[in-house]
Interface confidence: medium
């Protein structure tokens, strides 16, 4: 499919003047390549009339011009004083004009309305509001005042003064007569519909004597905006209809066969399935204006998209509307990611987030996607080191691999947390993506304690146990807070015990706090990973208190670190399932944290062991296929 | 329960300077993103710049890029604009307002996005 996208049909009037805008994506190729308009023939063919290297034709001598624009990936062609002989099939397109890199145009110039003297002419959009005025003299001021629409041969009266209203206009017009001192009655036509278009005749009177005036109303098919975004990207339709439908239902619809539009969101809370988890319908303001956020487009989202008011939320005849028709380009410069990661029960995922690598300093965040009234996208944590009070513990983003790829690694998972989730910078907007999580049947890889308590001035060991299909990767004990999570020495005691039908390749690393301090209470991480890439992820709760007498918990799980069998395990651990997960909540509640801020320090915390490096990553369920 | 209140407003001459302060005080202000309206007498409130809680993100209007500038200090409850370059059309009453953290998906630039108002401090620049 070609990738050239502009606009379908183009219409105008003989006389005028047409600008016609065609997209291409911006390559550097594309950005230098030529340019060209030309006309097909009908027996195949197309002959150029003007390109971006000069040429120009005869037949657009002194009344065209082609201008290309390479930082937006458009070019232009402005035609002027267009006759009926410009109607005809047209392509704009790059390179050479037979191979295939174009889009088709369509260019209707037909003849302007032929018009009576003294005729006033109403250009007016559909769904929106005319209002015909109609002088009358005095000798009129208390006689019958009529509208009447021509209708072939024949006058057919619209309206009149005695209350009389034309089935077709019922609910939508009306007649007023101006205040005494002025001689003008005007009739008011609301909602207007494409059949309205024609000429109407206003009568003062209904003699010889009654004055008369012509009106040419013109109602316009809104012309669509054309976009043109990349497949997997974010477009954003801006809605504005006007004040006076304000507190009418808001919608947006998408053109199938015909004059179908299937409503994709509305304000009275219908949603289409095709869009779930990727749509957001931002508030309308006070001026009747809203927008429309749709994010992962695909090649099925191309079309025509009309947006308007109606009591009903859908499109009906007579509903103010703006239209747009959206090109999704598949030469994407948004790499593929996973849309959908699973994720096992007590678990973890790690997600990769695309962004535009030209904006790396760009702030990222992470929100989830609320289906509620329509839509919001509350966030949950950002580059800066916020994370939201109940993420606390489980949720990290992190800068690694960067390059155009961030990630995002939320552990602990219960059935709550499957969703949709949207990845955001707050640069190019373009590049919101979408990733659904998914929580499956299974066990965690990783056995980790189910909680510790380390005693003041005592040394701690935590254990944590890696099944022998991890043997390939790096492991690692890091310790959370808001900005990442900081890597911590550990020790790679052997193979671990804690897995049936698990060779010598089953890893036990442990993580050893010497001198325990109040400071060491918190989150602790262990986790798997390849590079700059992340996998599986499992968390612990270390609770610090006074010494007490000996037998305290941890002690058995020095011991099970110490000589891990069976009977100790059972005891000491736990695989954590969903159930059982020590809530982060309760330890934000314990201590009143509002939400986690590192204030002293806003700058992002490393995790690799020793490095400076920024800690990245990838689902276990997609790892290194990058 | 975020309280604002808005100074530094007065009257320069065109292509003079003036800073505008906001400070916050109730709820915690450093969880906040923060913004900058202004409203001239017969015109709608509109937007004039934003900074994110951290101050690592800023968003202005066009009309104000490069002349404008905002800034918060976390430790000291408050959020600054540095207006440059003033001309006659900036005058207006202009009000701080501060946001509950929710939603990054619009970059508060909408004055409904907004849960706490200042007053509003005057500004006016004689030609």
């Known amino acids: 499919k070609s990738p050239i996208f502009g606009p379908e049909e183009v219409n105008s009037v003989e006389g005028n003047s047409v600008s016609i805008t065609c997209y291409y994506p911006p390559t550097s190729v594309n950005r230098h390549t030529r340019k060209y308009w030309c006309r097909q023939g009908a027996r195949g063919g197309c002959i150029t009339l003007i390109s971006s290297e000069g040429y120009v034709s005869s037949k657009y001598a002194g009344r065209a011009n082609l201008t290309n624009f390479p930082e937006n990936g458009t070019f232009v062609v402005n035609i002027a004083q267009l006759s009926q002989d410009d109607s005809g099939r047209y392509k704009c397109g790059l390179g050479i004009n037979s191979r295939g890199l174009s889009f088709d145009v369509s260019l209707e110039v037909s003849q302007g309305p032929g018009l009576l003297n003294d005729t006033k002419v109403y250009t007016v959009d559909l769904g929106r509001t005319v209002t015909i005025n109609c002088p009358f003299k005095t000798e009129n001021a208390q006689k019958r005042k009529s509208l009447y629409k021509q209708i072939g041969l024949y006058p057919v009266l619209v309206i009149d003064s005695s209350g009389y209203v034309n089935p077709n206009y019922t609910g939508r017009i009306r007649l007023d007569i101006q205040g005494t001192g002025q001689l003008l009655f005007s009739v008011v036509i609301n909602q207007l519909r494409l059949s309205d278009a024609g000429q109407y005749l206003c009568q003062a009177g209904d003699d010889s004597n009654s004055n008369k005036k012509n009106a040419d109303l013109q109602v316009l098919k809104p012309e669509p905006e054309l976009v043109y975004e990349d497949l997997r990207g974010s477009v954003t339709f801006h809605c504005a209809l006007g004040p006076e439908v304000a507190n009418v239902a808001k919608f947006l619809c998408r053109q199938s066969s015909g004059e179908n539009c299937d409503v994709v969101v509305n304000t009275l809370g219908k949603r289409a399935p095709a869009f779930e988890g990727r749509i957001l319908l931002n508030p309308q303001d006070k001026d009747g204006s809203f927008s429309v956020v749709i994010t992962g487009l695909r090649k099925e989202d191309a079309g025509r998209y009309l947006c308007g008011a109606h009591s009903d939320g859908q499109l009906q005849e007579g509903s103010p509307i703006q239209a747009w028709q959206l090109f999704v380009n598949e030469e994407s410069t948004i790499p593929r990611s996973p849309t959908v990661v699973k994720g096992v029960a007590g678990s973890s995922v790690a997600v990769l987030c695309p962004y535009n690598r030209k904006e790396s300093k760009s702030i990222k965040y992470w929100c989830l996607w609320e289906g509620a009234q329509n839509g919001r996208c509350p966030l949950l944590v950002d580059s800066e080191g916020w994370v939201k009070a109940q993420y606390e513990g489980r949720l990290s983003l992190l800068e690694e691999p960067g390059n155009g790829t961030f990630t995002v690694i939320l552990n602990q998972l219960t059935s709550r947390d499957a969703g949709f989730y949207w990845c955001l910078t707050n640069g190019d907007t373009l590049w919101r993506t979408t990733v659904e999580i998914k929580i499956i049947e299974g066990e965690p890889n990783l056995k980790v304690p189910g909680n510790v308590t380390a005693v003041l001035g005592e040394t701690l060991k935590v254990p944590c146990h890696f099944p022998c299909k991890f043997s390939s990767y790096e492991k690692y004990w890091c310790k959370w807070n808001n900005t990442g999570c900081q890597a911590l020495p550990s020790q790679d005691e052997g193979p671990s015990k804690a897995f049936v039908n698990c060779d010598e390749n089953s890893r036990l690393v442990s993580l050893t706090l010497n001198l325990v301090t109040r400071a060491d209470e918190g989150w602790y991480w262990c986790g798997v990973k390849q590079g700059h890439f992340y996998g599986e992820t499992a968390a612990v709760y270390v609770a610090v208190e006074e010494r007490k007498a000996a037998g305290s918990r941890d002690v058995s799980l020095a011991k099970a670190d110490a000589a891990p069998d069976e009977k100790v395990l059972d005891s000491g651990f736990r695989e954590i399932e969903n159930k059982a997960i020590q809530d982060p909540r309760l330890f934000a509640e314990e201590k009143a944290v509002a939400d986690t801020r590192d204030q002293a320090d806003g700058s992002r915390a490393s995790v690799d062991s020793g490095s400076s490096e920024e800690q990245g990553g990838s689902s276990r369920h997609h790892h290194h296929h990058h | 329960e975020v309280q604002l209140v808005e100074s530094g407003g007065g009257l320069v001459q065109a292509g003079g300077s003036l800073r505008l302060s906001c400070a916050a005080s109730?709820?915690?202000?450093?969880?906040?993103?923060m913004g900058w309206f202004r409203q001239a007498p017969g015109k709608e409130r509109e937007f004039v710049a934003a900074?994110?809680?951290?101050?690592?993100?800023?968003y202005y209007a066009d009309s104000v890029k490069g002349r404008f500038t905002i800034s918060r200090d976390n430790a000291k409850n408050t959020v600054t604009l540095q207006m440059n370059s003033l001309k006659p059309e900036d005058t207006a009453v202009y009000y701080c307002?501060?946001?509950?953290?929710?939603?990054?998906?619009?970059?508060?630039?909408?004055?409904?996005?907004?849960?706490?108002w200042g007053q509003g401090t005057q500004v006016t620049v004689s030609s």
């Open positions: 307002a501060s946001r509950d953290y929710s939603d990054p998906i619009s970059l508060w630039v909408e004055d409904r996005e907004y849960d706490y």
């Open positions: 109730g709820r915690t202000f450093s969880s906040n993103p």
């Open positions: 900074i994110s809680w951290s101050g690592g993100g800023t």
